[in-house]
């Protein structure tokens, strides 16, 4: 008989570079056998991982794997940092590798032209 644990598939040193102001979905790939486990996201802060209980999350089900998604709508500069997803399974807690978000604040980088500017001066798209 094959073992049937809940599994979390975030690889070592997983990272994403994203822009503040954009929407972003952080995915935790989860594999389970029968009952979908309770999965949560937390953000590393010093030696603790602080649960993100008030954030929008959702599930995306695919054929061989499911994804527990943390939504950033939009990404904020202070979303920069490392996150883990964790699952409770038969009274065991399993925690993923950390995944790091590197947030670029577009205001502090080269000023991004506004939508109005883009419409009136489309060449800005190509500079």
């Amino acid at each position: 008989k094959e073992s049937c644990d809940v599994q979390l598939y975030i690889k070592r040193q997983s990272e994403h570079s994203i822009l503040a102001g954009d929407p972003f979905e952080l995915e935790c790939p989860v594999k389970y056998c029968a009952n979908r486990p309770h999965v949560t996201w937390c953000k590393l802060n010093g030696t603790t991982c602080v649960k993100l209980e008030d954030r929008q999350t959702s599930w995306k089900e695919e054929k061989n794997i499911s994804f527990f998604i943390l939504h950033f709508e939009p990404v904020l500069p202070n979303d920069n940092g490392s996150y883990r997803c964790s699952a409770n399974f038969q009274s065991n807690l399993i925690e993923s590798h950390s995944t790091t978000l590197y947030v670029t604040d577009v205001k502090s980088a080269s000023e991004r032209p506004s939508k109005d500017e883009m419409a009136s001066r489309p060449w800005l798209l190509y500079r």
């Epitope: 599994q7 979390l8 598939y9 590393l44 399993i94 590798h97």
Partner: antibody, heavy 118, light 106 residues
Framework: QVQLKESGPGLVAPSQSLSITCTVS????????VNWVRQPPGKGLEWLGM???????DYNSALKSRLSINKDNSKSQVFLKMNSLQTDDTARYYC????????????WGQGTSVTVSS | SIVMTQTPKFLLVSAGDRVTITCKAS??????VAWYQQKPGQSPKLLIY???NRYTGVPDRFTGSGYGTDFTFTISTVQAEDLAVYFC????????FGGGTKLEIK
């Protein structure tokens, strides 16, 4: 129950290549990553590399040019190939399963002893 | 790659003693540290993961602690069957092991 079993040639001539098979039971290779670790006689453990559920691989950077890891999910087998062996590659070679979160190795095979000698 | 410096290399203790082994990582590894026990002629066995979580079936005399770069493994009351080599391992980046601590019982 979960088991891993390594099988290898035992003796390899210097400059030749090494092929070891890890046959697993009690779990599926579509659900767990598998690592390769070696241990020279009387010494410590060295991680060689691993294969993920999707078939992607990670290697020890110092050995990357000499290593390849593959698997056959249907046969529940993982394969280690190492090229250009030298005497300091003499070791016991283990395969070990990743924990469900990928953050430790929870089941190990008994290992297969490999001696590099002419 | 991250270097795990494990001390001491050898420990000679009496049954009933308390034993502490330390591992220092060359850079922060969060709590991505595991401890293994390897008895003579056997393969390694997982004892501790997430730096401080005891693996299934592991006696509670074995404990781990630490975060970042400094980690400790303790056997509160050594028993004769604890004769083994103990290894720490980081799994934050490509896995690396400490050099091992050989525990011998007087």
């Amino acid at each position: 129950q979960v088991q891993l079993k390594e099988s290898g040639p035992g003796l390899v001539a210097p400059s030749q290549s090494l092929s070891i098979t890890c046959t697993v039971s009690g779990f599926s290779l579509t659900g767990y990553g598998v690592n390769w670790v070696r241990q020279p006689p009387g010494k410590g453990l060295e991680w060689l590399g691993m294969i993920w559920i999707d078939g992607s691989t990670d290697y020890n950077s110092a050995l990357k040019s000499r290593l390849s890891i593959n698997k056959d999910n249907s046969k529940s087998q993982v394969f280690l190939k190492m090229n250009s062996l030298q005497t300091d590659d003499t070791a016991r070679y283990y395969c070990a399963r990743d924990r469900p979160d990928g953050r430790a190795m929870d089941y190990w095979g008994q290992g297969t002893s490999v001696t590099v000698s002419s | 790659s991250i270097v795990m410096t494990q001390t001491p290399k050898f420990l000679l203790v009496s049954a009933g003693d308390r034993v502490t082994i330390t591992c220092k990582a060359s850079q922060s590894v969060s709590n991505d540290v595991a401890w293994y026990q390897q008895k003579p002629g056997q393969s390694p066995k997982l004892l501790i993961y997430y730096a401080s979580n005891r693996y299934t079936g592991v006696p509670d005399r074995f404990t781990g602690s630490g975060y970042g770069t400094d980690f400790t493994f303790t056997i509160s009351t050594v028993q004769a069957e604890d004769l083994a080599v103990y290894f720490c391992q980081q799994d934050y980046s490509s896995p690396t092991f400490g050099g091992g601590t050989k525990l011998e019982i007087k």
